[in-house]
């Protein structure tokens, strides 16, 4: 467990000409606030998916009124940090969306009006416990400067907040196999063992021996999916046996999401997944156009010349999402055939093919036997992307060039002696055994466990293996 912290340093016009108009005016004073949404960076969720790592809203900033004729300065910001608590391990790679919102304080009927000023997104690597990382992002003509960090909440430590620390039981040193907790040298790393059988996918623990469930799962070992179908009422009492959860009225009741947005509950509130062209806490904001620069990572904005027509971002190879904000793990689609190794080079995919295969996706099976001769009467057999020789009797090796010693593999069982023979090998069996490889015991009364020996061969005679 831990907290992701975001510090906004400034929000104002970016460098260069084309400065944006101030969002506030003497007639329409306003104030800013920010929203941050975090997702695990390696997740293959859709770009519009909920903020799986969490989300947070800042406080409102000071009221600002534009000075007539003055260019838009850096706008006054809310105090304090935006904090996004995370319950589980810190993923190390994460995607963020930071939205700058304007709250208009004129005489609106029904309270203040909100509108989205700017939206930036990115994907970063970050170890928990590290220093503040600084960043600058541009959205259209606006520029946002901010810092962020992830820190673990005691007793968790480490770059993923998965190790636990406990006060030392002995003053001098930690227990066997346990290290001191840097930077808390007076504490010791604690082994974290969840309750036996706790689902590794759907459960976690913050204390040894416990099993706490991720959202959507229940039961003592977090193996029961939450379902309301077996409940007496849609929001019946919580029960680990039936898997019924979510008592009382839910935050999505009545669907607070406008414009066709879909609502999903979060631990603290709700999250609206908005259709393309709509944004905001409740999908109430429309009118984002290509002029707002909504496409990240080199994406090209298509359509959306006016607020009434939705834009589409065409993303460069390697990015996806409605705003090209998400890097694609193209190797997860397993494009390399025939066991080829996939390499995502960023600008392109490469397949490293196994022997005997070729082509951009290792799709071509080479003629393994072409130009390859097997010596001494052997025949070439294709298979597995590499040629193989099936050798004539008495020869072996990759190309049948080696004379085989048929006795090398000790083929005679039960102490039988092997003799090389022009047509193969012969086993001279020890008393009490018979068969081509001396594999059958002879019964004391002279009968064998198998049909009698062929005519002309007595038990104990050498058996020639043809």
């Amino acid at each position: 467990a831990g907290v992701f912290e975001l510090q906004i340093h400034s929000f104002g016009p970016g460098p260069g000409p084309g400065a944006p108009r101030s969002p506030c005016s003497a007639r329409l004073p306003c104030r800013l606030f920010f929203r941050v949404c975090l997702k695990p960076g390696l997740s293959e969720e859709a770009a519009e998916s909920p903020c799986a790592l969490g989300a947070a809203l800042s406080a409102r900033g000071p009221v600002y009124t534009e000075q007539p004729g003055a260019p838009a300065p850096d706008l006054p910001l809310p105090d304090g940090l935006l904090q996004v608590p995370f319950r589980d391990a810190w993923p190390g790679t994460f995607s963020f969306i930071i939205e700058t919102w304007r709250e208009e304080l004129g005489d609106q009927i029904g309270g203040p009006a909100w509108s989205l000023l700017a939206r930036v997104a990115g994907r970063r690597r970050l170890a928990a416990g590290g220093p503040w990382a600084r960043d600058i992002q541009r959205a259209g003509a606006w520029e946002l400067r901010f810092s962020y960090r992830a820190r673990c909440e005691p007793p968790a430590v480490g770059t993923a907040c998965t190790r636990l620390c406990r006060p030392r039981s002995a003053p001098s040193r930690c227990g066997p196999g346990l290290r001191p907790c840097a930077p808390l040298e007076d504490e010791c790393e604690a082994p974290l063992v969840c309750r036996a059988g706790c689902s590794p996918e759907h459960g976690f623990c913050e204390q040894p021996g416990e099993c706490r469930c991720l959202e959507g799962w229940t039961g003592p070992l977090c193996t029961v999916p939450v379902s309301t179908s077996s409940c007496l009422s849609p929001r019946g009492p919580s029960s680990a046996t039936t898997g019924c959860l979510v008592p009382g009225p839910g935050p999505c009741d009545g669907n607070p999401c406008a414009n066709g947005g879909s609502c999903s509950e979060t631990p603290r509130s709700f999250e609206c997944t908005c259709p393309r062209g709509f944004y905001g806490l409740r999908c109430e904001v429309s009118g984002v156009t290509c002029a707002d620069g909504p496409c990240f990572n080199g994406g090209l904005c298509v359509g959306g010349a006016d607020p009434d027509s939705a834009y589409i971002c065409h993303c460069p190879p390697g990015f996806q999402g409605s705003n090209c904000e998400k890097r694609v793990d193209r190797c997860s689609l397993q494009p390399c055939r025939n066991g080829g190794l996939c390499l995502d080079l960023g600008h392109a995919l490469r397949c490293r093919c196994r022997a005997g295969f070729a082509g951009p996706r290792c799709e071509h099976d080479l003629d393994d036997c072409a130009g390859r001769a097997c010596a001494n009467g052997g025949t070439c057999v294709e298979g597995g992307g590499a040629h193989r020789c099936s050798c004539a009797l008495g020869f072996g090796g990759r190309d049948c060039r080696e004379r085989a010693d048929p006795c090398a593999a000790r083929p005679c069982a039960h102490g039988g002696r092997c003799y090389a023979h022009f047509s193969g090998l012969v086993c001279a069996c020890a008393p009490g055994y018979m068969g081509a490889r001396c594999e059958f015991p002879v019964h004391p009364d002279g009968a064998s466990a198998l049909p009698a020996a062929p005519p002309g061969l007595r038990p104990g005679d050498p058996q020639r293996y043809l």
């Epitope: 080199g298 904005c301 190879p317």
Partner: antibody, heavy 118, light 108 residues
Framework: QVQLQESGPGLVKPSETLSLTCTVS????????WSWIRQSPGKGLEWIGY???????NYNPSLKSRVTISVDTSKNQFSLNLNSVTAADTAFYFC????????????WGQGTLVTVSS | EIVLTQSPDTLSLSPGERATLSCRAS???????LAWYQQKPGQAPRLLIY???SRATGIPDRFSGSGSGTDFTLTISRLEPEDFEVYYC?????????FGQGTRLEIK
């Protein structure tokens, strides 16, 4: 090294269809967007459109009603069809590869002159 | 569409001098998605700069790009004889992709 080579007739009659093919060597056509650009003395450089795999295309609105760009991954080629041509379509036509960090053009063919005349 | 206007149309300088070419957009170019090209007679354009300031592979460091919003600049710090060609800017933030009309750099 990626190389692009345009091919097709250098002379097209008015009202007919201009058809050009770009053959890509030294790289897989599946991994990038591919574009056509033309250059005429009167209009300078003009982007025509692009294709990605075969399912994503985008065309210049000024030409959209007349243009089709398609790709043949098996031959490592992509093609331009511009129908109902007039003398105003006389230009050098370039095929180009679109870059990996955005929709700029990092590799170009040497270009082919197409004249529209009866 | 975003109209790109390059200035001057022709720039006359001597080898060794510094060249400053301007490209102005009719509206803000998203996220500095602007490229510069050089074109020699009878050849295709060659990419010099993308992302307003990133040099393409193999481009000498005397070429540099700057700017954001609506104003962008290509600078050639010390002109070599082979630099006297035509230069184009191109925006790729908003469809349709558009080019400037070009600036001819000639020897004074």
């Amino acid at each position: 090294q990626v190389q692009l080579q345009e091919s097709g007739p250098g002379l097209v009659k008015p009202s007919e269809t201009l058809s050009l093919t770009c053959t890509v060597s030294g790289g897989s056509i599946s991994s990038y967007y591919w574009s056509w650009i033309r250059q005429s003395p009167g209009k300078g450089l003009e982007w025509i459109g692009y294709v990605y795999y075969s399912d994503i295309t985008n065309y210049n609105p000024s030409l959209k009603s007349r243009v089709t760009i398609s790709v043949d991954t098996s031959k490592n080629q992509f093609s331009l069809n511009l129908n109902s041509v007039t003398a105003a379509d006389t230009a050098f036509y370039f095929c180009a590869r679109i870059g990996v960090a955005g929709f700029y053009f990092d590799y170009w063919g040497q270009g082919t002159l197409v004249t529209v005349s009866s | 569409e975003i109209v790109l206007t390059q200035s001057p149309d022709t720039l006359s300088l001597s080898p060794g001098e510094r060249a400053t070419l301007s490209c102005r957009a009719s509206q803000s170019v998203s996220r500095r998605y602007l490229a510069w090209y050089q074109q020699k007679p009878g050849q295709a354009p060659r990419l010099l700069i993308y992302g307003a300031s990133s040099r393409a592979t193999g481009i000498p460091d005397r070429f540099s790009g700057s700017g954001s919003g609506t104003d962008f600049t290509l600078t050639i710090s010390r002109l070599e004889p082979e630099d006297f060609e035509v230069y184009y800017c191109q925006q790729y933030g908003t469809s349709p992709i558009t080019f400037g009309q070009g600036t001819r750099l000639e020897i004074k």
